[in-house]
């Protein structure tokens, strides 16, 4: 199996097992109850059969209990994300027990060896949960296992081995290598808890996928398609994260799942919504912004429990940093005629004007091609809440921005030197907001002028019958 290039550490020659010394190495798992929001505090260590620490450290038997499970490590120390997550859980659920599962000695190994250790760590967690269940008032239903990377599969094993069913498992970019395509009992799967929700942020269809691509939960959420995360490009990393290397890009994208979850804990007033869709391409086309029949959900901690017959893949766009929430819009543009389009696809931009704010100029991504006498659907998203939309400016970019388009223009010119003006006719744009589920129709300001050509713009205002609101549920109403 391939060894990934450092999903939770730096890319260097640290993949060997630590050198053995005369000290006996205990291949054990520790449970650290984080008793304080202060990340420096040493916390309390819990062990099966020892009730005193539960009393000394005020373990709350009736409260929610979170187990945070780290993944593979190249450094042998806790990654910095862990303290953020602990703090966020304490902030959101003040009475909850937050337990860090420390399996560093077993994770600080060759990746393949760490993978082989996940089962034994899962067993240790299950034993701890079985022991806690013997206590009065402790309920497995209140247990929420949160596993990052390899830790997500550890959570799966724990959920599989425990006597009973844990309430919830959240998989934060579950590890891909050695788990992709594996049997359900050898990876995180929906039967490991009453509710299994998963965030996928580093999946790749080419090369090595650090995160698992396949759906493994009741709901599997793929922010930004589950691959390229905004703010994690090499340029972004050079400027902000420790140092700009490919490894840091990997780390940034893989770890983004943790930050999206933290965001859902600390910014509950700015929830991000994901929409069910069969694949990323269809989502990019703007086809999947429905909230009917549980087709949308909050992401992260606020996700509503959905136990579907089959895995539900959900998608959303995000900002580059916290708060990650964006506002999604489906734009349906009916092109009823066009002239002399040639080989090249037009490059369109829209600017949305609302009661609260105006958007930036947003590109319309043409996933396939512009169809004539058909409704073309696009996805656009804004970082700010525009309020109610008032008008839309549609611009057809003039000069070609890519060498490829320039070449195609040149070829078109050679074959058709007189090249009469390219033109496209659009009468109306239908807009649906993902977040409010409201639908609006916008008509050209001048009903006589419906044509647009390169370098020109067309303005649309709400049609007279404009404020059509379908009987669909708004996700904002459904927050827990």
């Amino acid at each position: 199996s391939p060894v990934p290039f450092g999903p939770e550490g730096r890319l260097e020659d640290k993949l060997h097992k630590p050198k053995a010394t005369q000290t006996e190495v205990k291949p054990s798992v520790r449970f650290n109850l984080r008793t304080s929001k202060d990340p420096e505090h040493e916390g309390c260590y819990l062990s099966v059969g020892h009730s005193q620490p539960l009393e000394d450290c005020s373990f709350n038997m009736t409260a929610k209990t979170f187990f945070i499970i780290h993944g593979w490590t190249m450094s042998g120390i806790f990654e910095n994300w862990l303290h953020k997550l602990v703090s966020a859980l304490h902030t959101r659920e003040k009475d909850a027990n937050v337990v860090v599962v420390d399996w560093l000695p077993l994770a600080h190994q060759l990746y393949t060896d760490a993978v082989n250790n996940t089962r034994v760590v899962g067993h240790s967690i299950a034993r701890m949960l079985d022991w806690l269940q013997e206590k009065d008032d402790f309920s497995l239903g209140n247990v929420h296992l949160i596993g990052y990377s390899l830790g997500a599969h550890v959570a799966g094993y724990a959920g599989n081995f425990v006597k009973g069913t844990v309430g919830r498992i959240t998989g934060l970019d579950p590890a891909g290598p050695m788990f992709e395509g594996a049997d359900i009992h050898k990876r995180l799967s929906p039967d490991d808890a009453d509710f299994v929700d998963v965030l996928h942020t580093y999946t790749r269809s080419f090369g090595l996928s650090i995160g698992i691509q396949m759906p493994v939960g009741h709901i599997d959420i793929y922010p930004n398609g589950g691959d390229f995360q905004p703010g994690c490009g090499l340029n972004d990393v050079l400027g902000s994260i420790a140092y700009g290397t490919i490894t840091e890009v990997v780390k940034c994208e893989h770890e983004r799942a943790v930050h999206l979850f933290v965001d859902s804990l600390v910014n509950q007033d700015k929830p991000s919504f994901a929409f069910q869709c069969t694949d990323s391409n269809r989502f990019k086309k703007g086809i999947c912004l429905s909230c009917r029949k549980n087709r949308c959900n909050s992401i992260g901690y606020n996700a509503k429990k959905m136990r579907n017959k089959r895995n539900s893949k959900m998608y959303l766009k995000t900002r580059a940093g916290m708060p990650f929430r964006v506002y999604h819009y489906q734009m349906k543009i009916h092109v009823f005629s066009y002239k002399n389009m040639g080989e090249i696809e037009p490059t369109f931009y829209v600017t949305l004007y609302g009661t609260n704010a105006d958007s930036q100029t947003l590109p319309l991504e043409i996933v396939e091609r512009i169809e004539q006498n058909a409704t073309n659907t696009f996805l656009v998203y804004t970082e700010e809440d525009l309020g109610d939309l008032l008008k839309i400016q549609l611009t057809w970019e003039g000069a070609s921005q890519s060498w490829y388009n320039l070449w195609k223009e040149f070829r078109s010119y050679l074959s058709q030197p007189r090249n009469p003006g390219r033109e496209l006719n659009i009468r109306r744009i239908r807009v649906k907001s993902g977040e409010t589920q409201r639908k609006l129709t916008f008509c050209t300001e001048d009903p006589e002028n419906t044509s647009i050509s390169p370098g020109r713009e067309l303005w649309f205002r709400k049609c007279r019958d404009g404020w059509r609101m379908k009987n669909e549920t708004s996700p904002t109403v459904e927050l827990p």
Epitope: R10, P18, K19, T21, T23, E24, V25, K26, P27, S28, R30, N32, R34, D38, P39, E40, H41, E42, G43, Y45, S75, G76, I77, F78, N80, L82, H83, K84, V100, D102, L104, P105, H108, S240, I241, A242, Y243
Partner: antibody, heavy 120, light 111 residues
Framework: QVQLVQSGAEVKKPGASVKVSCKAS????????MNWVRQAPGQGLEWMGW????????TYAGDFKGRFTFTLDTSTSTAYMELSSLRSEDTAVYYC?????????????WGKGTTVTVSS | DIQLTQSPSSLSASVGDRVTITCKAS??????????MHWYQQKPGKAPKLLIY???NLASGVPSRFSGSGSGTDFTLTISSLQPEDFATYYC?????????FGGGTKVEIK
């Protein structure tokens, strides 16, 4: 109170070995990692590595792989740093310092240091 | 590894002076809103002592004339009114990643 007590100064010949001890008291030994820091005469501080006091797994910094060995005796809450095949450039003060497993991992408690002199 | 460059390497000051020492990291030592930068004081023949942790937090028992500031790659240690016992060498340290590294030190001497 929390303290780290290190063994006394050592004078060794080149090629010999030395074992420096660091005994912890006033806290739960296994709840903090133990680090080793070297300071050559008139020079700055150099991190040598650390040992996980619970698992016994040592980690060595790049320049300290090979001749250096970190070990533990958890029954006496003592960490050891052994250096073999001594050279004159190993002459330095060696400090042990604890750091938490959680949070920002600064070195909040230091031993007084053990001076190792390598001279023929 | 992250390099830390301290300046000045030495300075002469009088009791009561305001002293500022800077530490520049070769890359950011911030993680989210936390800075993994710390300051230590070392007197001749003694072990280093933690002064400031996480850029601006005063360690237990450290006088309030010491303060730290900064984020990203640029950090400052300030002694608002230098006292006789403050003549020592000061080191910055980053712990955002292993190996933790120290700056070269700034020696504060009596003018």
């Amino acid at each position: 109170q929390v303290q780290l007590v290190q063994s006394g100064a050592e004078v060794k010949k080149p090629g010999a070995s030395v074992k420096v001890s660091c005994k912890a008291s006033g806290y739960t030994f296994t709840n903090y990692g133990m680090n080793w820091v070297r300071q050559a005469p008139g020079q700055g501080l150099e991190w040598m590595g650390w040992i996980n006091t619970y698992s016994g797994v040592p980690t060595y910094a790049g320049d300290f792989k090979g001749r250096f060995t970190f070990t533990l005796d958890t029954s006496t809450s003592t960490a050891y740093m052994e250096l073999s095949s001594l050279r004159s450039e190993d002459t330095a003060v060696y400090y042990c310092a604890r750091r938490g497993y959680y949070g920002r991992r600064y070195f909040d408690v230091w031993g007084k240091g053990t001076t190792v002199t390598v001279s023929s | 590894d992250i390099q830390l460059t301290q300046s000045p390497s030495s300075l002469s000051a009088s009791v009561g002076d305001r002293v500022t020492i800077t530490c520049k990291a070769s890359q950011s030592v911030d993680y989210d809103v936390d800075s993994y930068m710390h300051w230590y004081q070392q007197k001749p023949g003694k072990a280093p002592k933690l002064l400031i942790y996480a850029a601006s937090n005063l360690a237990s028992g450290v006088p309030s004339r010491f303060s730290g500031s900064g984020s990203g790659t640029d950090f400052t240690l300030t002694i608002s009114s230098l006292q006789p016992e403050d003549f020592a060498t000061y080191y910055c340290q980053q712990t955002i990643e292993d190996p933790p590294t120290f700056g070269g030190g700034t020696k504060v001497e009596i003018k």
